[in-house]
């Protein structure tokens, strides 16, 4: 019996939340926070390899 | 239609306890972020704290003004939201308001008032 | 924390006349990424409790009147009113919510003549 196609998502890395308008998502932490809290993404240098930054998925009104 | 609706306040000495209650209906209560607020007597608002919705595992914010001596829980089965101050101070007698936290503070209740007096 | 300044504290139109009031962040409340602001404005008329007017800075919440207009960005924002109303007797607070603890100014009492 054929198996629908397996997540992409490691079992260590949930959907990301939603969250209220008022908030954005911090992908660091995996949680939603005040979008003061977090820093906008830079970017990075030609060949430069860094963790990734702390980035805001926000819901659409 | 939302409606919140608060409870529970009164006259308390210096040093007690009381606990406030919001009443909710006209939405879904575990979807929706709930925060409480006050104003003292002739005064601006001050924002107490919020807690986040089922989706994010009911986690709490707070100011650092009252962090450690206030409260915020709910029970989602009666669809009731709690302010639990302990340690009252003077300086803590208010208007207490609940309120729905979506774009930013949208819907408010009437608000309960606390004295804290000898 | 973030202060929130409003002035002036208090002024007095008369019915008609055009208002606006200001409200001064201690920090931008710019979230560069999405380019919202997060500062609030609301109405507490007499006895009541507030009431959301407009939010993100310029966004006036559902059922709100269209005289209410919220405009500026960063640290600096403006509430217009721009016919006043007897009705619209009120306290009026900005509130940023860019981050936590979420802060008020401390008010501009709206009074009619």
């Known amino acids: 019996m054929r198996r629908g196609p397996r997540s992409l998502r490691g079992r260590d890395a949930p959907a990301p939340t939603a969250c209220v308008p008022a908030e954005c998502f911090d992908l660091l932490v995996r949680h939603c926070v005040a979008c003061g809290l977090l820093r906008t993404p830079r970017p990075k240098p030609a060949g430069a390899s860094s963790p990734a930054p702390r980035t805001a998925l926000q819901p659409q009104e | 239609e939302v409606k919140l609706v608060e409870s529970g306040g009164g006259l308390v000495q210096p040093g007690g306890s009381l606990r406030l209650s919001c009443a909710i209906s006209?939405?879904?209560?575990?979807?929706?972020?709930m925060s409480w607020v006050r104003q003292p007597p002739g005064k601006a608002l001050e924002w107490l704290g919020f807690?986040?919705?089922?989706?994010?595992?009911?986690?709490?914010e707070y100011n650092p003004s009252v962090k450690g001596r206030f409260t915020i829980s709910r029970d989602n089965s009666q669809s009731i939201f709690y302010l639990q101050m302990n340690t009252l101070r003077a300086e803590d007698s208010a208007t207490y308001y609940c309120?729905?936290?979506?774009?930013?503070?949208?819907?408010w209740g009437q608000g309960t008032t606390v004295t804290v007096s000898a | 924390d973030i202060v929130m300044s409003q002035s002036p504290s208090s002024l007095a139109v008369s019915v008609g006349e055009k208002v606006t009031m200001s409200c001064k962040s201690s920090?931008?409340?710019?979230?560069?990424?999405?380019?919202?602001?997060?500062l609030a404005w609301y109405q507490q008329k007499p006895g009541q409790s507030p009431k959301l007017l407009i939010y993100w800075a310029s966004t006036r919440e559902s059922g709100v009147p269209d005289r209410f207009t919220g405009s500026g960005s960063g640290t600096d924002f403006t509430l217009t009113i721009s016919s006043v109303k007897a009705e619209d007797l009120a306290v009026y607070y900005c509130?940023?919510?860019?981050?936590?603890?979420?802060?008020f100014g401390g008010g501009t009492k709206l009074e009619i003549k």
């Open positions: 309120a729905q936290v979506r774009r930013a503070l949208d819907y």
């Open positions: 807690i986040r919705d089922k989706a994010n595992g009911y986690t709490t």
């Open positions: 006209g939405f879904t209560v575990t979807a929706y972020y």
């Open positions: 920090q931008s409340l710019l979230y560069s990424s999405n380019q919202n602001n997060y």
């Open positions: 509130q940023q919510y860019y981050t936590y603890p979420y802060t």
